[in-house]
């Protein structure tokens, strides 16, 4: 086989997804390794090829894009699972090539199971809230691109095992969860579940994050307060953007 620029296994992108949920995974080549995007590559006559190696196997296999109900599909530079299965776990490779050029990268995908209270081996992003500092919000993360804006999903928020309802200072507002005044008792894991219809089927997206309420330090200034509104995503959680 011809020489191919092999970026190896990108272990910085330890992608974890829940079993039986949709997942959209962008080829990392265009995000981290190449200086051009998919559209440019496609216009230049380059083809994006996907294949994978199952967990505990060495054999590279093509991905089966002819499964019932198009369970796995490719759209531009995104690999779609609608939905995932436990045995989709493995190392996935995207290769960009034509007759004169070749570049590829692999990344691990782990399909994980959650329990009845949303606990799982998933690595959770942490969102800091400042104690007793006005209204602060967290947003259900990594749900962009799953459904068009014409689709109106339903969103259910949980703290630990329990639906958030009739809480004194925590109010679900669609994709956002508002903390009227953050207290130490608000520390914990928060889960949003987004439910949406697609082609006569119902899909669910489960996203859990850890809220950490920290003391405010006036000397840090307003800049830190604005920074607190942003979710501190671990590097491996950038895969949906």
């Amino acid at each position: 086989s011809e020489r191919c620029d092999d970026w190896g296994l990108d272990t910085m992108r330890q992608i974890q997804v829940f079993e039986d949920e949709p997942a959209r995974i962008k080829c990392p080549l265009f995000e981290h390794f190449l200086k051009f995007n998919y559209s440019t590559a496609h216009s230049a006559g380059l083809t994006l090829i996907w294949y994978w190696t199952r967990q505990d196997r060495d054999l590279e296999e093509p991905i089966n894009f002819r499964l019932p109900e198009n369970r796995i599909s490719k759209e531009k530079d995104v690999l779609w699972f609608r939905p995932t299965l436990l045995n989709d776990t493995g190392n996935y490779t995207c290769m960009l090539r034509n007759t004169t050029y070749c570049s590829k990268v692999a990344f691990p995908l782990e399909v994980v199971q959650k329990d009845s209270c949303f606990n799982s081996p998933m690595k959770l992003p942490v969102h800091k809230l400042y104690i007793e500092y006005g209204i602060q919000r967290i947003t259900c993360p990594n749900v962009d691109g799953y459904f068009p804006s014409s689709v109106k999903p339903t969103i259910t928020w949980y703290m630990g095992c329990y639906k958030i309802q009739n809480f004194n200072n925590v109010i679900p507002e669609g994709m956002n969860l508002s903390f009227l005044i953050a207290l130490i008792s608000n520390n914990g894991n928060y889960t949003c579940v987004v439910t949406y219809p697609e082609n006569g089927r119902t899909f669910h997206l489960t996203r859990t994050l850890t809220v950490k309420v920290v003391g405010s330090d006036i000397s840090r200034g307003l800049n830190d307060i604005f920074e607190a509104q942003k979710i501190e995503w671990h590097e491996h959680h950038h895969h949906h953007h």
Epitope: F18, E19, D20, P83, L85, L86, Q113, K114, D115, S116, C117, T154, T156, K163, Q165, N166, V193, T195, T202, H204
Partner: antibody, heavy 117, light 107 residues
């Protein structure tokens, strides 16, 4: 597509037990709740309880606590509902209903249990 | 337990009519309300979840609304295949509880 296939009709004596099965396919059995709902002849729907096969967590309606047992076999993707100390008023159609969250998205075809001496 | 009261218990309407069924909870249920359709001799089917979310594959003539303790299911233009009994169900607080049902017939 999601399918829930329940076991066949049963005729039982008062005081005995019945075990109804619900075989699931077309979704990840371990990752959804399995509910059990019953409907007496000509009556409405009555929720009995639910189980999360992934970890075995169960919730029961107070009315059935101690008399109903919900179990799940992940290896065969089958859920079971056992009701003991049967009485005539337990005569009903028993349904299993799957829900990723709390709504019961899909239902089995129902199992008629007749309690008669 | 939360009590769910449905009204009317039965109704008869003509094809094309707008049909409204109401459901009242004994306490606030924060929009955690489902509607199910059950045709004679069949298992129930989920129509609407979380007050207004149309379940996949359900015709758009069905809609839901409400808040607090009072909720409504509307069929904008009744069709012959809509003959069934409709149940509301709260899932705010365990145990989940159903309304008594509304039987819909064609005149």
């Amino acid at each position: 597509q999601v399918q829930l296939v329940q076991s066949g009709a049963e005729v039982k004596k008062p005081g005995s037990s019945v075990k109804v099965s619900c075989k699931a396919s077309g979704y990840a059995f371990s990752s959804s709740w399995m509910n059990w709902v019953r409907q007496a002849p000509g009556q409405g729907l009555e929720w009995m309880g639910r189980i999360y096969p992934g970890d075995g967590n169960t919730h029961y309606a107070q009315k059935f606590q101690g008399r109903v047992t919900l179990t799940a076999d992940k290896s065969t993707s089958t859920a079971y509902m056992e009701l003991s100390s049967l009485r005539s008023e337990d005569t009903a159609v028993y349904y299993c209903g799957e829900g990723y969250l709390d709504p019961m998205d899909y239902w089995g075809q129902g199992t008629l249990v007749t309690v008669s001496s | 337990d939360i009590q769910m009261t449905q009204s009317p218990s039965s109704l008869s309407a003509s094809v094309g009519d707008r049909v409204t069924i109401t459901c009242s909870a004994s306490q606030g249920i924060n929009n955690y309300l489902n509607w199910y359709q059950q045709k004679p001799g069949k298992a129930p089917k989920l129509l609407i979840h979380y007050t207004s979310g149309l379940h996949a594959g359900v015709p758009s003539r069905f809609s839901g609304s409400g808040s607090g303790t009072d909720y409504t299911l509307t069929i904008s233009s009744l069709q012959p295949e809509d003959v069934a009994t409709y149940y509301c169900q709260q899932y705010s607080i365990l145990p989940w509880t159903f309304g008594g049902g509304t039987k819909v017939e064609i005149k």
